[in-house]
């Protein structure tokens, strides 16, 4: 799915009002020094691509994030604010239903959610590299690419 045409400000609002708090709840009890963020993103569509992948794609050692509260809210936000997104997610929904049986918080899942928090931070922040990538802070003209 190409996230270029999403309403980024609305997704950001959904994240800050609820999803971020669910991620913090999931991570509660974890030392803030425990994980090093290794996944990064360069602009908002790229961040959403990485967020979708980490949230919904089962990985070795962490197969069950898709049924967590933050994941369901993320899915709802993308479905509402990214045109055509929900049509692309029928297969993913089936995979989610299969994963529902086991809900185990492993260290690998905690690491993955820490990575997610980092990706969301980059989604929310202005781009640091001034190289003509998508301007994060772009609400009136959000799909034009330009320098800060």
């Amino acid at each position: 799915y190409d996230f270029t045409n999403c309403d980024f400000e609305k997704i950001k609002a959904a994240y800050l009002s609820t999803i971020s708090k669910d991620l913090i709840t999931y991570m509660s009890g974890t030392k803030s020094t425990e994980f090093n963020n290794t996944v990064s993103c360069s602009n908002r569509p790229h961040c959403l691509t990485e967020i979708q992948s980490l949230t919904f794609n089962p990985t070795a050692g962490c197969a069950s994030l898709a049924k967590e509260m933050f994941a369901m809210k993320t899915k709802a936000a993308l479905a509402i604010w990214c045109p055509g997104y929900s049509e692309t997610q029928i297969n993913a929904t089936q995979a989610m239903k299969k994963a529902r049986k086991s809900k185990v918080t492993t260290n690998k899942c905690l690491e993955q959610v820490s990575q997610l928090q980092g990706l969301w931070r980059r989604f929310n922040r202005p781009l640091l590299k001034q190289q003509g990538s998508s301007d994060y802070k772009d609400d009136d003209d959000k799909h034009h690419h330009h320098h800060h």
Partner: antibody, heavy 119, light 107 residues
């Protein structure tokens, strides 16, 4: 507990340079941006710039471009600001601050470093 | 650069009364506004982010509202410990900019 501890006060001559350090602890240093803000005596807050300690990316306020240099040393979890060609107007308290968990605010601040520029 | 203008510059309110501080942006900053409190001789402290979201541990008497260009920080019932300078900040475009500050005192 997250902490940002800054280096001590400095007195400098006009035209010289100063380097202020900000040592982070209590979290993974490379995961969060570090911001630099200054406050002249009796004045408000002025944003200088930001660095991503994870990859060294920076963004500067144009007012400081060419004079301010932000760096970070992951091995010691320390961020630095160097300000060159100092003038009396640079007399201020310099703060480092960490971005919060959502990336939309500065949640932890250093105690501040007073830099006095005087001949 | 986006200019953030606070009003009033200073404000005296009686204990237990409501205090309201306004912040106007020179152009739309969406909802990317943060409020900080700074007491004399201390570093700033985060109060409210993204217009209205409370930072951890901030008392409920502090609230934020607004969108676009006009924003407000409200203290519903002023306490003695709320005496400080309050700053708004836009997080929408580089360079990040602060308001000039509003000094809040007890009447």
């Amino acid at each position: 507990e997250v902490q940002l501890v800054q280096s001590g006060a400095e007195v400098k001559k006009p035209g010289s340079s100063v380097k202020v350090s900000c040592k982070a602890s209590g979290y993974t240093f490379s995961n969060y941006l570090i911001e630099w803000v200054r406050q002249a005596p009796g004045q408000g807050l002025e944003w200088i710039g930001v660095i991503d300690p994870g990859n060294g990316d920076t963004n500067y306020n144009e007012n400081f471009k060419g004079r301010a240099t932000l760096t970070a040393d992951k091995s010691t979890s320390t961020a630095y600001i160097e300000l060159s060609s100092l003038r009396s107007e640079d007399t201020a308290v310099y703060y480092c601050a960490r971005e919060d968990n959502t990336g939309t605010a500065f949640d932890y601040w250093g105690q501040g470093t007073t830099v006095t520029v005087s001949s | 650069d986006i200019v953030m203008t606070q009003s009033p510059d200073s404000l005296a309110v009686s204990l237990g009364e409501r205090a309201t501080i306004n912040c106007k942006a020179s152009q739309s900053v969406s909802s990317d506004v943060t409020w900080y409190q700074q007491k004399p001789g201390q570093s700033p402290k985060l109060l409210i982010y993204y217009v209205s979201q409370h930072y951890t541990g901030v008392p409920d008497r502090f609230s934020g509202s607004g969108s676009g260009t006009d924003f407000t920080l409200t203290i519903s019932s002023l306490q003695a410990e709320d005496v400080a300078v309050y700053y708004c900040q836009q997080h929408h475009r580089f360079p990040l900019t602060f308001g000039q500050g509003t000094k809040l005192e007890i009447k």
